[in-house]
């Protein structure tokens, strides 16, 4: 039975040209995390594998950085970066857990960050 829950940064906003940290955390399970995938809609941004470390998709190499921890840092944000982001935790023996974050990139300087690790 899958008992775990994913906590995420929830709905967040950031300024165009700035950077943002996307973070998820899997709790309430003793399952071993073997890999975490970060995806934007249907595009793979990055993979963090427990044995092999990080792999950043070549098309995002200049704007995506790993960390902090299992999180992902997005840099040089554009309005086109607005949308849904998913952290996909591959675990044993539970299987797959998915967390969702919605990022809105704003033109103005009134971007407000959502509360950290709110359950969406």
């Amino acid at each position: 039975m899958m008992t775990g829950t994913i906590e995420t940064t929830g709905n967040i906003s950031a300024e165009k040209g700035g950077s943002i940290i996307l973070q998820c955390h899997l709790s309430s399970t003793t399952a071993q995390v073997t890999q975490v995938n970060w995806e934007q809609q249907d595009q793979l941004l990055a993979i963090c594998n427990a044995d092999l470390g990080w792999h950043i998709s070549p098309s995002f190499k200049d704007r995506v950085a790993p960390g902090p921890g299992l999180g992902l840092t997005l840099q040089s944000l554009t309005v086109n970066d607005t949308g849904e982001y998913f952290c996909i935790y591959h675990t044993y023996p539970d299987g797959t857990y998915t967390g969702r974050i919605f990022l809105e990139v704003l033109e103005s300087s009134v971007a407000e960050h959502g509360a950290r690790f709110q359950i969406p």
């Epitope: 906590e7 940290i21 973070q23 955390h25 709790s27 003793t30 995390v33 975490v36 963090c48 594998n49 427990a50 092999l52 470390g53 990080w54 792999h55 950043i56 190499k61 200049d62 950085a65 790993p66 960390g67 902090p68 921890g69 299992l70 840092t73 840099q75 950290r116 690790f117």
Partner: antibody, heavy 117, light 106 residues
């Protein structure tokens, strides 16, 4: 097996700068963040920042911005930290450590820096 | 920044005794890492993601906690466990460490 080999102890004058190295082996250098941590007897462990050698991204503790500069040379799998405008407060042991999402799993042996006036 | 406070700077325990050391954070964090360091050596990853034991760590060690309160427990103290233990968080930038708990053998 991952291994991090740090450069030797440094005795440097106040006001000068120092550049230490951390040579990585036994793993893919560009797939892990490389952190630097300061340790002093009275202050414990302080996180300085990290570099991701895969694209050169750096993330600094604000307290060390302008004091420390992190770089990496992927051709030699070596990370560097330069500390400038040294004062007695910078006398410490500096560790490099590898991190791939699940805490800092491999540490170098440390580089001791002593600042003399 | 989040400040981590380790309950005791120094603890002493007899062989076979149960030991619990705590780490409290000034704000809620999602998980905690623990490192063991013996005199003159580098720190070693000991417990990560609150409760997962690093490779080679004896099963007598365990970690638990949530929110602002975390702990490391040794079910039965052994001589080789004498060391300094540091907690570390990275739910919030910058990463911070506790001041350490030095565990001595009685």
């Amino acid at each position: 097996q991952a291994y991090l080999q740090q450069s030797g102890a440094e005795l440097v004058r106040s006001g000068a700068s120092v550049k230490m190295s951390c040579k990585a082996s036994g793993y893919t250098f560009t797939s892990y963040n490389l952190h630097w941590v300061k340790q002093t007897p009275g202050q414990g462990l302080k996180w300085i920042g990290y570099i991701y050698p895969g694209n050169g991204y750096t993330n600094y503790n604000q307290k060390f911005k302008g004091k420390a500069t992190l770089t990496a040379d992927t051709s030699s799998s070596t990370a560097y930290m330069q500390i400038n405008s040294l004062t007695s407060e910078d006398s410490a042991v500096y560790f490099c450590a590898r991190e791939g999402g699940w805490a800092m799993d491999y540490w170098g042996q440390g580089t001791s820096v002593t600042v003399s006036s | 920044q989040i400040v981590l406070t380790q309950s005791s700077a120094i603890m002493s325990a007899s062989p076979g005794e149960k030991v619990t050391m705590t780490c409290s954070a000034t704000s809620s964090v999602s998980s905690m890492h623990w490192y063991q360091q013996k005199s003159g050596t580098s720190p070693k990853r000991w417990i990560y993601d609150t409760s997962k034991l690093a490779s080679g760590v004896p099963a007598r060690f365990s970690g638990s906690g949530s929110g602002t309160s975390y702990s490391l427990t040794i079910s039965s103290m052994e001589a080789e466990d004498a060391a300094t233990y540091y907690c570390q968080q990275w739910s919030s930038n910058p990463s911070t460490f506790g001041a350490g708990t030095k565990l001595e053998l009685k």
